[in-house]
Every structure is written in C-alpha cells, then in structure tokens.
Interface confidence: medium
C-alpha cells in the first residue's frame, strides 16, 4: 500500500490520543535503553510503511502483535485516514485469522514494540516538513 495520500495529521492525532498510551502499557517494566533501535524511516509515508510492517507482519519470535490494542487502533486509524487502505487489508486479515496463535509477550515482541515507538516518534516530528 502507498501511504502517500494519508491524512498524516489525523493519524498523528490518533497516535497522541490513544495509540501511544497503549504502546507504553505494552512496554511497562521495560528499560528505555534495553533495546537498540535498528529500524528507521526517512519520511512520513515511509514511516507508515515500516509501522505497518512491524505491527502486522509476524516475525520470528513475535507472531502476536496484530491482536494487541495498539495494533487494532493503528489499523483503525490507517483505515479511516488512508484512502483505500481497508481494501488492501482484507486478504491479509483473512490469512491472519487462519494462523492465529496464543498471545505471548516475548522479549522479541518487546524489542519490536520498542522499534515501533521510535518509528512513531519519527512519523510525528519529521524535521523537514514532508508532504
């Protein structure tokens, strides 16, 4: 999906209002320096691409993030403020239902959510104004 035409400020407002708090809840008890951030993004569409990937694509050691509260709210924000996003996610959602796994908070998941926090921070305040 091409995130270029999303309403970035509306997504930012959704993040600051709710998603950020859910990420903090997920990470509670974890030191802010515990993980090295290896994922970065250069502009807002790129940040959303990386956020979508880390939030919804199962990875080795962390297959359960898509069912977390922050993920569901992220999905809702993208569906509302990114034209055509919902349609692109139907097949992906159906595939996810087939491989639903037991919800486990692993260290790998904590590391992934730490990366997400950095990506969201970058999305919210790109230094150079990006369209």
């Amino acid at each position: 999906y091409d995130f270029t035409n999303c309403d970035f400020e509306k997504i930012k407002a959704a993040y600051l209002s709710t998603i950020s708090k859910d990420l903090i809840t997920y990470m509670s008890g974890t030191k802010s320096t515990e993980f090295n951030n290896t994922v970065s993004c250069s502009n807002r569409p790129h940040c959303l691409t990386e956020i979508q990937s880390l939030t919804f694509n199962p990875t080795a050691g962390c297959a359960s993030l898509a069912k977390e509260m922050f993920a569901m709210k992220t999905k809702a924000a993208l569906a509302i403020w990114c034209p055509g996003y919902s349609e692109t996610q139907i097949n992906a959602t159906q595939a996810m239902k087939k491989r639903r796994k037991r919800k486990v908070t692993t260290n790998k998941c904590l590391e992934q959510v730490s990366q997400l926090q950095g990506l969201w921070r970058r999305f919210n305040r790109p230094l150079l104004k990006q369209q």
Epitope: K10, K12, S32, S40, G118, W120, R121, R122, R125, L127
Partner: antibody, heavy 120, light 111 residues
Framework: EVQLVQSGAEVKKPGSSVKVSCKAS????????MHWVKHAPGQGLEWIGA????????SYNQKFKDRATLTVDKSTSTAYMELSSLRSEDTAVYYC?????????????WGQGTTVTVSS | DIVLTQSPDSLAVSLGERATINCRAS??????????MHWYQQKPGQPPKLLIY???NLGSGVPDRFSGSGSGTDFTLTISSLQAEDVAVYYC?????????FGQGTKLEIK
C-alpha cells in the same frame, strides 16, 4: 537516568569558531530529535536548529543556517553544535535539549548549558 | 515564522494569589484538534523546565497549581496560588510550524 551533559565554558575571539558537545545517556539516542537553543544575556530563548541522529538529517533556523553546523556521533551518543565566524552577539548560554517521547515537539530533557563568551 | 507575543513582559503577584500569563500566536498552532503550544519555567542559572505541553497537559512532576488553557492563537498559563519558588521567567513555545519559536518571556516576581 535520562540526562544530557554538555561541555564546559568557552572564551573565544571574534571570527573564530566554537564546538559545543552534548553527551546523552539513559535513552535510545538515535531515535530522538536533538535541538539546540541560544539564551543571550537579558534576552529570550532562540531556537538554533535540530538534528535527527538516526540519519543525521538537520533543520535550521534561517538566522543561524550559514554559521551553525549540527552533527552527531552515534557511537558515543553525542550531539555537537559548531558556530563559526563568532561575533560579540554570540555571547550566550547554549543548551542542547531532547524532544519528547512522542514527537509532540516539547523539550523534556535539557543539558546544563554551555556558556560561550566572545571577546577580543 | 509564527511570532509568539507574551503579555505582560513582567508581573508582580502576592504570595498565595493567582498569576496569569498570556501568549498570542501570529497564526494558529492547532492541528487536527490538538494545540501544539508548550510552556516552560526558567530560573536564573538553570535550563528551562517543561511545565505544560500541548496547551493544557501538566508536565511530569509539575505541581497542580500550574495549569494551561487555550487553542488556536490564544493561550494562557495560570498559577492558582503563587509560591516563592515560582519566581522565574516563563516562556511559551510552538512547534506546529518550523522554525520552532519561543515567546519573549514573562518575568514573574513577588509583590
């Protein structure tokens, strides 16, 4: 503990340059915008610019764009601000500051400040 | 650039009384219903300290006698009951539009 520790006071001649350092600890340096702010005697706060350590991207106040250079050393979690062609009106306390956790644009952690005196 | 104009430039208030500082922006600092205006307190020889973020949210460890209000272009910082340790210079700051700008500062003293 999250903190920013700046280098010591400097006395410089007009026309010379100064490089102020700001060492970060207690947080993931590469994912936070780092800013520099000037506070001249008897005046208000003035934003110089900012740098994103993740990729070195910078943004400057046009007033300082020609003379200020912001850099980072990710290996030591240190931000630098170099100011060239110094003049008397550059005499000020210079602060580095970390932008907040969420990208809301406020500064939640500040360095202790570095006094730069420009005098012949 | 967005110009922030604080009023008054200086203010003397009795201990226990209310202090009010205003900040007017030359254009709106709102985005999608959120106001990106922040307030700081600076004491002599110290760096600024965050008091209020996004117009009305109390910074970490800030006493609840401090409060902020406003939206669009007009914002207010209020200290409900002035304490001796509140003597300082107060600044508003916006980051809605680059470059980031501060108000000129308001010096608060005890009457």
């Amino acid at each position: 503990e999250v903190q920013l520790v700046q280098s010591g006071a400097e006395v410089k001649k007009p026309g010379s340059s100064v490089k102020v350092s700001c060492k970060a600890s207690g947080f993931t340096f590469s994912t936070y915008n780092m800013h520099w702010v000037k506070h001249a005697p008897g005046q208000g706060l003035e934003w110089i610019g900012a740098i994103y350590p993740g990729n070195g991207e910078t943004s400057y106040n046009q007033k300082f764009k020609d003379r200020a250079t912001l850099t980072v050393d990710k290996s030591t979690s240190t931000a630098y601000m170099e100011l060239s062609s110094l003049r008397s009106e550059d005499t000020a306390v210079y602060y580095c500051a970390r932008e907040d956790d969420y990208g809301e644009g406020y500064f939640d952690v500040w360095g202790q400040g570095t006094t730069v005196t420009v005098s012949s | 650039d967005i110009v922030l104009t604080q009023s008054p430039d200086s203010l003397a208030v009795s201990l226990g009384e209310r202090a009010t500082i205003n900040c007017r922006a030359s254009e709106s600092v709102d985005q999608s219903g959120l106001s990106f205006m922040h307030w700081y307190q600076q004491k002599p020889g110290q760096p600024p300290k965050l008091l209020i973020y996004r117009a009305s949210n109390l910074g970490s460890g800030v006493p609840d006698r401090f409060s902020g209000s406003g939206s669009g272009t007009d914002f207010t910082l209020t200290i409900s009951s002035l304490q001796a340790e509140d003597v300082a210079v107060y600044y508003c700051q916006q980051i809605n539009t680059d470059p980031l700008t501060f108000g000129q500062g308001t010096k608060l003293e005890i009457k």
